[in-house]
Structure formats: C-alpha cells, structure tokens
C-alpha cells in the first residue's frame, strides 16, 4: 500500500549489523507523486566500490546510488548525511553485509517523504501537445482556441473528423485551407456513394501541399485514400505526388489527413465524384456477348450466347446462353458460368451390339457402333458412326439421333450340312447346321425360330398346349443337355385363323393352314447354335420347282426309335402334289378321299425313303435362298404325311408371309419397335 | 424294349476294387447316356457319375473323383464302373440308369448289383 | 456340388391323408428337380420331373410345384401303395444331387 513517507534502519540498528546479510526495501508513494530519500546516518565497512559491505538504492532498473563508509552532514542545521530525488513513485533499497567485519559498524538510518513532480519540466519527453498544467501529485493539458483535447488527454486537434459526404459530386479541402492546416491532427473524412458507383477523386498537383516526408521517405504529415482493402497514399509534398485522377472501384471512400507537432503547410483541395462501376469487358471463350459495347457498366445488361457445340452447365441443366448483370461491386453476375464443350455423354449401349469407350465425349467426338458380327448385322443403316453434335445429342448422318439398331442375321448356319454317316433315311446333324431348329418338349415337335421373339411352328403342335416349353442350342435332346441349353419361355400363341380346331385332333383329314407362330417373353440371345432362318420374299422367286432341294431336320421318329436323342436332318427334293396323294396313308383314321390337299401344301420327299416323321412337326423345309446363296429360307414347315419314308407334306409358308409380318407387327414390344 | 441287365454280386475285400458291367439290349449304347447310382443297405440313393457322350467326358461326383472310372465298350453295347480302393462303407447296390430325354432325369433303371466290402 | 435338403426325414400319415414333402436346394436350380418313389429292394421309380410334369402312368394324386430353391411334392390323398421313400433330385448341370430321403410310414 503506497504512503507518503517512511523510515528505513539497517539490521540491529543502532547496535551493529550482523555479517552475511542482505534485506531489501520496496518503497512506494502513490502515484503523481516522486520520492524524497535521505540518510541521517551512515556507518558501513568501507571498501572499494562498496564490494563488501553496502546499501544499494535502485529506481526501476536504473541504480541510484551505492553507499559505504561514514558520511556527516555537511550543514549543521540538517541531519542529513546523503539524499537521493527520484520522480518515480517506486524505489528499492537494498542493503548488504559480507561475512566478517573488522570493526563494530552500526550500520544506517534513513527516511523518504513523498514528494511532488512537475511532470511539465522534469521530464525530456513533455507529456502534452499544447500546453502542461503542474499541481501537486499530478498535472493536465489544455489546449489553444478551436481545438480539442484528444481521448488519451494529452494531445490536441482540430475538430475535422465526421463529416459523411453522401452527394454524387463535391470538394474536400484540409482544415482552414488554404490557411496552414492545424497541427496534430488527425481528420478523417467519408464518402459513401450509392452502391454501383465508384468514388472518382481528382486532385490539381498545385492544389496539395503538405509537410514533406522525412530523410527516411515517411510522411511526417500524410494524405491516405482508403476503399475497401485498397490503399492509395500515403501523399506529402509539395504538389501532388499521386494520380491526379483516382478511380477507386468502390462506393465507400475514407480520406485520412494526419498531422504532426511541426511544419504546417496550406494543405490540399480535392474534387470527387460518383461514376456507375465499370465491369470489365471479359474475354469469355466460345461466345459471343449482345450487346457489343466498348464499355460496360453498373446495371449493364448483356446476353451472353454460346457458339455451336457448345453449352453453359448450370447443375445438370446445360442451356445455350445466359444473361449476366454489371453489378454494383463491379463485378458480372454469373461469372461462374462458362460456355462449355456439349458433352454428349457416354454413349447408350445397344442390344446385341457395341460401342468401343470414346476417348472423348464432348462436342466433335467420334464414335462407332458395331454389332455382334457374325450373328447381329446394323438393320437401320447409317454404317454405326455417330458424331457429337451441337445440341449434345450423338447424330448419325443418316438415322440422326436414333441408336442402331442391332438385328439377328438370318439363314446362315455356322457350320454346313453334309450329309456324312449313312443313317437310314437321313443323317446325324449338329445344331450349328440349323441353328433356328427349336425343340418341343410336349407334344414332342420343332419349330423354327425367325427372329428374336418369334418362334413359327406348325398349328398342329401347339393347338393342344398353348403354353409350350421350347428349348434352342442344342444337338441333343438328353436331359442334361437341355439343361444347358436356352429354354424359351412363350408369351403368347397365335394359329392361323383359318386352322380348324377339332374336338377329336387325332382323326383330322385337313391340314390345311398349318401354321402357328408363339411369341416369346423374352428375346433370343444369337451365336453360333442359335441363329433365325429368314423368311422367304414375297416374288416369285420364291415360288418353288419340283425338284428344288431343301433340308429338314428335327428330333422326330426315326427307323430305330421313337424318338431321337440327336439332330436328325436329310436333304429332300419337292415332289408334284399329286405324289402325296398317291401314297397310302399308313394308319388311315378315315377314307383316303377324306385327307384335304392344298395349294397351300408342299409334296416333298420319296428319294431314298428320306422323309420327315412324327415328332419332327413344325420343322422347317429349308431352303437355300435364290437372291443369296448364302443364305436359307423356310420355305415349309413339316405338316403331316401319309407314311413315314415315303413323301410328306409341308406348310407352304410363301403364302403366309402377310399374315406372319401382320401378326408380329401388331404384337411387338416397344423395345422392339 | 430297351432292357439294362447288370453283372452279379460281388464280395471285395478293402482296399480291392470292383468292376460293374450293364449291358444295353433293344438299343445301342451311343445313343444314350450312362449314369451311375448306388445306395447303401438302409440309405439313401448317391449319384456316382456318368459319361457324356456330347463332350466325350466323363464326370464324377467329388465324393469319387480318383476313386471312380466309368467306360464304354461301344461294340458290345456294355457301360463299365469300377470302383478302387474299397472301403466297408462302399458297400451297397450299385445302379447303371440311362438319362432320358427332354426333361425326363433317369429312364431305365438296371437290376442292381450288389457289391459287399468285408474283411 | 449342389445339396439337397429334404424334410421331413420322416413322416407318418394315414390313408386318405393329404402329406407335403419339401425340398430346398442349395442354389438355384430353376425347375431340373425330379421326385422319385422307391420300395424296399426295388428301384426307384420317377413320378414327377421338371418340377412339375407328372410321369406317365403315375396316378394324379401326385403333384409337384415350386422352381429355383424351394420344392414341393403333395400326395393329395395317400394310399395304401404310397407308403414308400421319397428321394428328390436336382439335376440342373451335370452333377445330379439326390435329397437324402422322406420315409412316409403308417400312422
């Protein structure tokens, strides 16, 4: 706790001090205040700079004074023996003793008095800017007419600071101008424009004159111009040093004039004015901007279109243009938008095709669709190759946005019949000989599979299960090879309306329009054992010769057995229709006058007792195409026979071309379509 | 009528092997499929294996698999299983069936023969 | 290799009852199973294949449905003459799995 005075004895005093000594006082008189200290008595072993034994006074980090020896007054009509003035309030006194005295040495007495300071001349720095009041334990400034003591009490200015201009143009000039500006001062002025317009400031070099900068280059007395994080200044000298014309891209100005104690001058004089901000005429690639004008600025409007091929992406919604707005910061809206490259995406993948992964997608890309060659072929044309266009559509030149399309190739067996071992009647087949053949599980028959959903049978076949369980790609019919196989689930029969339908199938005489078609629930994957066989054209080269050779083949009766395990097949000449009427019917279930011949019927067979039989209904009579050899037709379907080796009949299909194309159409799928 | 007619009993002792004959009679053995099956006295039926003459293979169940060698003798009309390196627990009748078609698993069923494993 | 799982092991019934047998294959089979009747030193004898389709000669009163994993064969009203075993079989790939068997005994 701070006092005004006190006394302060060396150990045991006035009896001597003990060796091996050291205590310290903290003095303090509050504050304003100095401290008075003086010994009335001093009697400390001597020694060279008080090595040995000493008392110590210290006024912050300063050492005031170091005392040995014996001291008397000087002046009999004061005690005092040795003082010390300090304008601090704090002082330390420390005092010391070695370990051994030669003598009894009694040590010291001493007092302090607080006293006060005249902080306007006891000090180097002087602590006001104007003038310094002294009283006792303090002081105070004041300051000359028209100015203003500061916050921190010591300084003075003028009163220049607050003044908000608001108007779109107007003049600034330093305190008094062109009168000297005052010192110590600090005045700060702003400019708060409506926002989209920038502060402009025009100054004339001979209208600025301020205190010049010191040997360092710092102005003693400066000029700064503030918007936003943007400094311009600070300015001094004689004439203006900086751009006489300031454009400061902001709507908010602060003008801060500072000076110091010395050098005033006539200050400066400036002119501002409000511009609409200007955005920057940016080079945005791949567009084209409207309007087209020199330059643009605040509430600017322009229409920025992109050039073809290419898109502004805004999420995931791509547009050709977008507008963009001279803003009040002087910045475009939609700055971010950019006109892109179109990027047509990865390409749709097709069925029973491909498209090889583009090493681009974006406007101008290239890319090539191919089908499953040998077993799918590109049925819309266009040659599969699709460029990216402008509208981020992949286009074909011919088909223009509609994908390929990927259809079955028809007729062409992946391996040729021969007829190689001798088996009475026909021959061992493989499947890939006739990969259209489709089995029938019940009744136990074939069909012909003529493109992806389609499977063309006879009537007769599915007349009794319309509900068929169908299996394509093998030879044999063994259990576990169809387990292998595809099996084909139906969707729906349809049999030619003018089939007859009897009560009792088993006594039918009329076989006439024996066809049926199933459409399948699922499409028909193609390769090498499953394949379709076209269908013959509607000309007459279609129409067939007696003699005309076609193949049959099926997993029906053979001389052996019932039925065969493995793919029968043999290659049979069209006989006159007359021969199947000539033949016995074998098992006659009524007079032979009864069973009905038809144009709509093909005779075929009766060479080398090589003929279709029961279980190979349905099968197609295939024949090799007249317009392309490489290719087979079904130009019958097995039907019905009189005797088994001899001839048989088989569903002229030529005849019935309309009523399939009609019947698939009317029940495709959208996929198909 | 297609007829499968099996060999006749056989008594081994562990560790010797066994050779099954079944004879096709009413067809010819190319045109069909050999499986074979046994069933322990009071057990179950247990597929063995079979040839399949598509591939020109023989497959064998895992539990027999270098154990098991079917073969054909196409000339005679004659399958073949011999099963090596007996064990008590192979003992059980022994089954030669033909795989049917469209569907149908086994066909015609042999006699059986029944091949005893004792010391 | 594909298991197959049949239950019961055992079942007792008396004529004139309707009895279910299932089956549950390890993996999907679609409809390759078979159910077979076998009678103490006889062969066994198929009366359903493909899941459902019923053998020719076996009487109506057999009846199998089910496809992928789980099977079943119904014996709408037992008869003195089906008391026998029951085996189904998968046979979906060249590895043909029999069920370990379903004893149908008298009550």
């Known amino acids: 706790e701070p006092t005004m005075y006190g006394e302060i004895l060396s150990p045991n005093y006035p009896q001597a001090y003990p060796s091996e000594v050291e205590k310290s006082w903290d003095i303090e008189v509050p504050e304003g205040y100095g401290i008075h200290l003086y010994f009335t008595h001093l009697d400390i072993e001597l020694s060279e700079n008080c090595a040995y034994d000493s008392v110590q006074i210290i006024s912050g980090d300063t050492e005031e004074g170091r005392l040995c020896g014996q001291r008397s007054s000087n002046n009999p009509h004061s005690p005092i023996v040795e003082e010390f003035q300090v304008p601090y309030n704090k002082l330390q006194v420390i005092f010391k003793s070695d370990f051994s005295n030669e003598e009894r040495f009694t040590g010291f007495a001493a007092y302090y008095v607080a006293t006060d300071i005249n902080e306007c001349t006891d000090f180097v720095d002087v602590p006001c800017s104007h003038f310094c009041n002294n009283f006792i334990g303090g002081y105070f400034c004041s300051c000359p007419p028209e100015y203003f003591l500061h916050d921190d009490m010591k300084n003075c200015g003028v009163n220049c600071s607050g003044d908000v201009f608001t108007a779109l143009i107007g003049e600034i000039a330093s305190p008094n101008y062109p009168k000297p500006y005052p010192e110590n001062s600090r005045c700060e002025y702003q400019i708060r424009l409506e926002k989209g317009f920038q502060v402009v400031v025009t100054l004339r070099r001979e209208d600025f004159d301020v205190e010049a900068a010191d040997s360092a280059g710092n102005c003693l007395d400066s000029l700064v111009f503030v918007a936003g994080d943007r400094q311009f200044g600070p300015y001094c000298g004689h004439g203006f040093p900086g751009p006489l014309n300031i454009e400061t891209k902001s709507n908010a100005l602060d003008i801060i004039f500072q000076t110091d104690l010395t050098g005033q001058k006539k200050g400066w004089k400036l002119r501002y004015h409000g511009d609409p901000m200007p955005c920057p005429k940016e080079d945005t690639p791949n567009s084209v901007w409207e309007p087209a004008k020199a330059k643009y600025v605040f509430r600017d409007v322009v229409q920025i279109t992109c050039l073809d091929g290419f898109e502004v992406v805004e999420g995931r919604v791509g547009a050709t243009s977008f507008y963009s707005t001279c803003q009040s910061n002087g910045k475009w809206s939609n700055s971010k938008l950019k006109c892109q490259p179109v990027d047509c995406g990865i390409p749709e993948s097709i069925e029973n095709g491909k498209v090889e992964d583009p090493e681009s997608t974006l406007f101008g890309s290239v890319i090539r669709y191919t089908c499953e060659e040998p077993y799918y072929y590109m049925e819309n044309g266009g040659g599969g190759e699709y460029h990216c266009a402008g509208n981020g559509s992949w286009v074909n030149e011919v088909l223009g946005p509609e994908l390929p399309k990927c259809v079955p190739v028809c007729g062409v067996p992946r391996e040729p019949f021969e007829e190689k071992q001798r088996i009475i009647g026909g021959s061992d087949a493989d499947i890939k000989n006739f990969p259209w053949q489709v089995f029938f599980d019940n009744p136990w028959a074939g069909g012909a599979l003529i493109n992806e959903y389609w499977v063309l049978t006879a009537a007769h076949v599915v007349e009794g299960n319309r509900e068929p369980t169908m299996y394509v790609g093998s030879t044999s019919v063994q259990t576990s090879r169809l387990a292998k196989s595809k099996m084909l689930t139906p969707e729906h029969v349809f049999i030619h309306p003018g089939w007859k339908l009897l009560e009792v199938p088993e006594g039918r005489t009329n076989f006439d329009n024996d066809i049926a078609l199933v459409r399948l629930k699922d499409p028909v994957k193609m390769g090498p054992t499953v394949s379709p066989i076209c269908l013959p054209g509607t000309s007459s080269d279609y129409n067939l010769m007696d003699g005309d050779l076609g193949l049959i083949s099926g997993w029906g009766r053979t001389e052996k057995r019932d039925r065969a395990v493995r793919l029968k097949a043999a290659r049979l000449p069209v006989a006159p229709l007359r021969k199947c009427k000539e033949v016995k019917v074998e098992k006659p279930t009524a007079d032979a006058e009864a069973y009905v011949f038809t144009p709509n019927m093909i005779c075929a067979g009766g060479e080398k007792g090589m003929d279709s039989c029961k279980g190979d209904s349905g099968g197609a009579f295939a024949v090799q195409d007249p317009n392309d050899k490489t290719k087979f037709y079904a130009a019958g379907l097995v039907s019905w026979g009189p005797q088994c080796g001899t001839y048989g009949l088989y569903t002229r299909v030529k005849n019935y071309v309309d009523w399939i194309m009609k019947t698939m159409q009317e029940n495709s799928t959208p996929r198909e379509d | 009528q297609v007829q499968l007619v099996q060999s006749g009993a056989e008594v081994k002792k562990p560790g010797a092997s066994v050779k099954v004959s079944c004879k096709v009679s009413g067809d010819t053995l190319t045109e069909l499929s050999m499986h074979w099956v046994r069933q322990a006295p009071g057990k179950g039926l247990e597929w063995m294996g079979t040839f399949d003459p598509e591939e020109g293979e023989t497959i064998y169940a895992q539990k027999f698999q270098g154990r098991v060698t079917m073969t054909e003798d196409t000339s005679t009309d004659t399958a073949y299983m011999e099963l090596s390196s007996l064990r008590s627990e192979d003992t059980a009748v022994y089954y030669c069936?033909?795989?049917?078609?469209?569907?149908?698993?086994?066909?015609?069923w042999g006699q059986g023969t029944l091949v005893t494993v004792s010391s | 290799d594909i298991q197959m799982t049949q239950s019961p092991s055992t079942l007792s019934a008396s004529v004139g009852d309707r009895v279910t047998i299932t089956c549950r294959a390890s993996?999907?089979?679609?409809?390759?199973l078979a159910w077979y009747q076998q009678k103490p030193g006889k062969a066994p004898k198929l009366l359903i294949y493909k899941a459902s389709s019923l053998e020719s000669g076996v009487p109506s009163r057999f009846s199998g449905s089910g496809s992928g994993t789980e099977f079943t064969l119904t014996i709408s009203s037992l008869q003195p003459d089906d008391f026998a075993t029951y085996y189904c079989q998968s046979y979906n790939s060249y590895v043909w799995t029999f069920g370990q068997g379903t004893k149908v005994e008298i009550k």
């Open positions: 993996q999907s089979i679609s409809s390759w």
């Open positions: 069936v033909t795989e049917g078609l469209a569907g149908v698993p086994f066909d015609l």
